[in-house]
Interface confidence: low
């Protein structure tokens, strides 16, 4: 299928280089091995090239000793729990020379009443209990310690916080006689931060709170609270930042209205309205003040909460997010669709683009997909020639030694990257489109044609002629 982009890399990759020692930059405190990019100024690209070359030359001697795994630590404070009362926890891989800490919040939808929480417990227990968690996890994407896979922050201390509270990381209510389930997502984050202070976080320069999907929304809900906690505990110099991936949802009208019976058919506003009551969900204080009592649900929506946040946040969002389409009752199967649906989908992309207009640090490819930052090939997608790791590097530079984003963007180092083309997959670096029901890869050109896009429109970004495309479609190739 020619119009297809997969998450596999092209060709053979050179062996990934290990982490390695380097001399500190002038005027920086000497840090122990391994190299920490917080100590680097000036020409990052040439510096990276030198490091890579050095690292590759050392690779054969040390590759065997590399351990990519993050190790499970259940919280010592066992009163901070998953839904079923089992202790929450986190996976950690330390990088002792580094003063960067990446805390990643896992995603995985939510449940908002007794019935769908019971059902979730039966079918997705790992998302409600720590009882069967593996002892280790491999860091992928932005959690990888391999520069090949993670050119952005490969050397950071990596923390993966499993999602087991089903509350979009917002709850603060324990399990009790009255509550069958605990909803303590927000408290889990706070407790993990407290424990990590004793494991080296106290010496951090930057803490990046990242997350995907529900975890991305969790970042928006908790990033300021983490910064406040660190200030209260006496660590005001740790710069707290957020990276919200695929958690910037719209409270839009569904394509087809449906009753709020289960999680995925419930309109975004209905689900969150119900959830926030069921979870005793907390939202950022400054946002809460903007909405009257009972209207706090508004703060779960990125474009409403973002302007109230103090910490810098980088927003990553597919313009045609599959989770957004799912809650909007759009189910794409590659079958021909009516014009109304095509216009609905295009309008969704337009609306999303509009909400990112005033978000200086954003990366929004015109693709139909969901989540990106812990995919191994998160480096593959580009917007206007810039990859996500590159954009994050530029964002770091723009924030250097400052809590506030600099107003003037760095020349040749963009941080506001939002696709302007108006249909799904018009960006040639988009990942594979999959049938939502079967998981099968779909021919992009065929899929777009089914959606009613004209030949020229579909052919151009595939590097094809309309007549060539016709031939491919008639052949199903």
């Amino acid at each position: 299928s020619e119009g297809r982009k997969t998450w596999r890399r092209r060709g053979q990759q050179p062996p990934p280089p290990p982490r390695t020692e380097a001399a500190p930059a002038a005027g920086q405190p000497v840090e122990s091995f391994p190299l920490d990019f917080t100590a680097v100024e000036g020409n990052m690209d040439s510096f990276m090239a030198q490091v890579k070359s050095l690292a590759q030359s050392l690779y054969p001697c040390s590759a065997q000793q590399l351990n990519e795994d993050l190790r499970l630590h259940l919280l010592l404070n066992t009163s901070v729990t998953c839904n079923d009362g089992s202790p929450a926890g986190y996976y950690l891989k330390e990088s002792r020379g580094s003063r960067r800490w990446l805390l990643f919040l896992e995603g995985g939808w939510y449940c908002f009443n007794r019935e769908n929480c019971d059902s979730r417990y039966d079918t997705m227990r790992r998302l409600m209990s720590s009882r069967d968690w593996p002892r280790t996890r491999t860091g992928t994407g932005i959690l990888s310690s391999q520069p090949e896979e993670n050119p952005y922050w490969w050397n950071a201390n990596m923390v993966f916080i499993p999602y087991c509270s089903s509350d979009v990381w917002s709850g603060a209510s324990p399990k009790s006689d009255k509550n069958e389930y605990a909803f303590m997502g927000s408290l889990i984050i706070q407790e993990v931060v407290r424990e990590l202070l004793g494991k080296g976080l106290s010496g951090a320069k930057v803490l990046l709170l990242a997350g995907s999907s529900a975890g991305g929304t969790g970042v928006l809900l908790n990033v300021d609270r983490v910064a406040e906690l660190l200030e209260e505990l006496g660590y005001p110099s740790i710069q707290v930042r957020g990276l919200a991936d695929s958690g910037w949802f719209l409270d839009n009208k569904q394509y087809r209205r449906s009753d709020c019976i289960d999680t995925i058919n419930c309109a975004p506003t209905d689900a969150i309205r119900r959830g926030i009551r069921y979870w005793s969900g907390m939202v950022p204080e400054r946002c809460q003040r903007q909405f009257k009592e009972g209207e706090e649900w508004n703060c779960f929506f990125g474009y409403k909460v973002y302007p109230t946040l103090r910490c810098p946040v980088f927003v990553v969002q597919w313009l045609f997010d599959e989770a957004q389409l799912t809650v909007d009752n759009v189910h794409l199967t590659g079958q021909p669709v009516q014009e109304g649906l095509r216009l609905y989908i295009q309008n969704l992309g337009r609306e999303l683009r509009h909400t990112l207009k005033d978000v200086p640090a954003s990366f929004a490819p015109a693709c139909l997909s969901h989540e990106i930052i812990i995919r191994s090939h998160w480096t593959d997608v580009q917007v206007k020639g810039t990859s996500l790791p590159r954009a994050l590097h530029c964002w770091d530079r723009s924030l250097h030694d400052s809590h506030k984003a600099s107003k003037t963007p760095l020349k040749g180092c963009p941080v506001h990257l939002v696709d302007s083309c108006p249909w799904p997959h018009c960006n040639p670096s988009c990942p594979t489109v999959r049938d939502q029901f079967t998981g099968q890869e779909m021919n992009v050109a065929q899929f777009l044609m089914h959606m009613g896009f004209d030949m020229q429109t579909v052919a151009q970004p595939q590097g094809l002629e309309p007549s060539e495309l016709l031939g491919m479609l008639s052949n199903g190739s």
């Epitope: 297809r4 040639p428 151009q460």
Partner: antibody
């Protein structure tokens, strides 16, 4: 290892025929559109022909239209170029190349096979 | 057909210096924020090798000293710092429509 290997080149008289083959390995051949290019001695690269992944679409350069036929056998991972009514100006190194899924660039090239048309 | 005009035809650059090669298309080869221009390196007796795709993206395994830029009709390949092994002929290629065409090539010599 991703590889394309051409064969079938040689010396042929004007008006003669020749069939070039390109054997693909190390990737899912049936996923990719394939092209033939050529390069005359001391000259630049010239596109010759294209075939889509499922063989339904074929395109030819004006200079070879009606004389050359591109085909593929996805079961055997083979691309072919049947050349007839050969002329001296067809003398060149012939390369097969894989077109990447998106964007229309050629990320894998064969090593080439030489075709000489001379009396 | 889109005609690609490459300049200069040949270029001699000292080791460690910068080499700049230009490619101008007779028609715009960009659309929707993406530029369908690619760069290849070819050494004598070898096939072309993809260096840069979609104007500015470095192909996997290609050294970072190669970079591409440009949009619309004007594109540039930069090599800095030039190394001995970079002596070769460089071609630009567009894929905005069929047929794909190549520039006439720029021969880079290392002084």
């Amino acid at each position: 290892e991703v590889q394309l290997v051409e064969s079938g080149g040689g010396l042929v008289k004007p008006g003669g025929s020749l069939k070039l083959s390109c054997a693909a390995s190390g990737f899912t051949f049936s996923d990719y559109g394939m092209h033939w290019f050529r390069q005359a001695p001391e000259k630049g690269l010239e596109w010759v022909a294209y075939i889509s992944s499922g063989s339904r679409t074929v395109y030819y350069a004006d200079t070879v239209k009606g004389r050359f036929t591109i085909s593929r056998d996805n079961a055997k991972n083979t691309l072919s170029l049947q050349m007839t009514s050969l002329r001296s100006e067809d003398t060149a190194m012939y390369y097969c190349a894989r077109k990447h899924y998106n964007g229309g660039y050629f990320d894998v090239w064969g090593t080439g096979t030489t075709v000489t048309v001379s009396s | 057909d889109i005609v690609l005009t490459q300049s200069p035809a040949s270029l001699a650059v000292s080791l460690g210096q910068r080499a700049t090669i230009s490619c101008r298309a007779s028609k715009i080869v960009s659309t929707s924020g993406y530029s369908y221009m690619h760069w290849y390196q070819q050494k004598p007796g070898q096939p072309p090798k993809l260096l840069i795709y979609l104007a500015s993206n470095l192909e996997s395994g290609v050294p970072a000293r190669f970079s591409g830029s440009g949009s619309g009709t004007d594109f540039t390949l930069n090599i800095h710092p030039v190394e001995e092994e970079d002596a070769a002929t460089y071609y630009c290629q567009h894929s905005r429509e069929l047929p794909p065409t190549f520039g006439s090539g720029t021969k880079l010599e290392i002084k």
